[in-house]
């Protein structure tokens, strides 16, 4: 049994780091493998992660952590029974993938303005809470070419757009994702999308 693709890990900078790897053949990850992780810190203990299958030869493990600070560094040991398959290290602050925003809502009751709001996925005491910026994706269900991205570079988790920038009488969907420049993170996954029917009064044209 050998590791074909070494584990790569990302942290949500809150409580979970996710490590993925590939074996050289079909593997029952949860029965055959264990990923041990230990913070490089005085009097820390080794903790065990039981991996799950992620495709035939792929494995994924969700490492539970209490919280994360920039100094944290972990040793990782991948074991198959008594055999050490791979040894590595992981610094969560250097491999951050933020949590996806939630509760995306489209408020259509503001006069000819669409107000999109969502929730910051972090609690106020987490460092990323005040460092997230967002991308909002809006697209038409009827017209695949009608697809747009709005970059929200301020901290407030909301976006206002004029309803008239979208077509009237058509159903649209929106989703939002987050990233943090301070840690040069990857983008989060997209939030679940939300749907609304776009309708607004066309301005009366005078001839």
């Amino acid at each position: 049994m050998k590791v074909l693709q070494e584990p790569t890990c990302v942290s949500d900078y809150m409580s979970i780091s996710t490590c993925e790897w590939k074996m050289n053949g079909p593997t029952n990850c949860s029965t055959e493998l264990r990923l041990l992780y230990q913070l490089v810190f005085l009097l820390s203990e080794a903790h065990t992660c039981i991996p799950e299958n992620n495709g035939g030869a792929g494995c994924v493990c969700h490492l539970l952590m209490d919280d994360v600070v920039s100094a944290d560094n972990y040793t990782l040991d991948l074991w198959a029974g008594q055999q050490l398959l791979w040894k590595g290290s992981f610094k969560p602050s250097e491999h951050v993938k933020p949590r996806a925003p939630g509760n995306l809502t489209v408020h259509t009751n503001v006069s000819d303005t669409l107000l999109l709001t969502w929730s910051n996925p972090y609690p106020p005491d987490n460092y990323l809470y005040n460092h997230l910026t967002y991308a909002v994706n809006i697209w038409s269900e009827n017209d695949p070419a009608d697809f747009r991205i709005y970059n929200v570079t301020y901290l407030e988790p909301s976006l206002r757009i004029a309803a008239s920038t979208l077509k009237s009488g058509i159903s649209y969907r929106a989703r939002v994702r987050a990233w943090a420049q301070c840690y040069n993170t990857t983008w989060s996954e997209w939030s679940p999308s939300t749907k609304w029917h776009n309708s607004y009064r066309e301005p009366f044209e005078q001839h």
Epitope: L42, E45, M65, D67
Partner: antibody, heavy 125, light 112 residues
Framework: EVQLVESGGGLEQPGGSLRLSCAGS????????MTWVRQAPGKGLEWVSS????????YYADSVKGRFTISRDNSKNTLYLQMNSLRAEDTAVYYC??????????????????WGQGTTVTVSS | DIVMTQSPLSLPVTPGEPASISCTAS???????????VDWYLQKSGQSPQLLIY???KRASGVPDRFSGSGSGTDFTLKISRVEAEDVGFYYC?????????FGQGTKLEIK
Amino acid sequence: EVQLVESGGGLEQPGGSLRLSCAGSGFTFRTYAMTWVRQAPGKGLEWVSSISGSGGNIYYADSVKGRFTISRDNSKNTLYLQMNSLRAEDTAVYYCAKDRVSIYVRPRYYGLDVWGQGTTVTVSS
Amino acid sequence: DIVMTQSPLSLPVTPGEPASISCTASQSLLYSIGYNYVDWYLQKSGQSPQLLIYLGSKRASGVPDRFSGSGSGTDFTLKISRVEAEDVGFYYCMQSLTSPYTFGQGTKLEIK
């Protein structure tokens, strides 16, 4: 009441051995790292050794490395310090102390917040 | 090893007056924001040491609020706002960030 009680001290000749014990009560012993600190007569405090809650992680001062062994029996809520090849400079009061909560991924530290009453070790011929 | 240097080594104080003890580490004891691994202990005559302050500034349970700790990185201070007769003894700073734990030499606080 959270309490630590040391025992096992006494007079021993140079080159001899002693085993100190530290019985913990009033707290979940296995979840805490434990530490030994000593104090030579008229001197300051000196750290000796520490052990994590499971016993899987151990540290020693250079002055005792290879001679002293720290261990614990969580089923008995007891910490030990096996002292071999004793020297005159090991003469001191030995204290055990409750250290950080080591069951968390990053051990949670609240200082050495409980100390035993101390047990006296005298090494002399 | 991290060296902890305390000053002064002797501190005569009038009851009711403030007192301050300094502790300097040979390298930073800051692990992350708010986590300076420095403690302060008081050892009264014939007794075991008792914890006063941990993580640089957090007061231990049952410790009077006249005791406070401050500082970050390498420089730390223990302050007693109004010294009482019962505060006499030896005060030690200690670092617990890396092995070996190391103590300062101790400061003897006595009443004038």
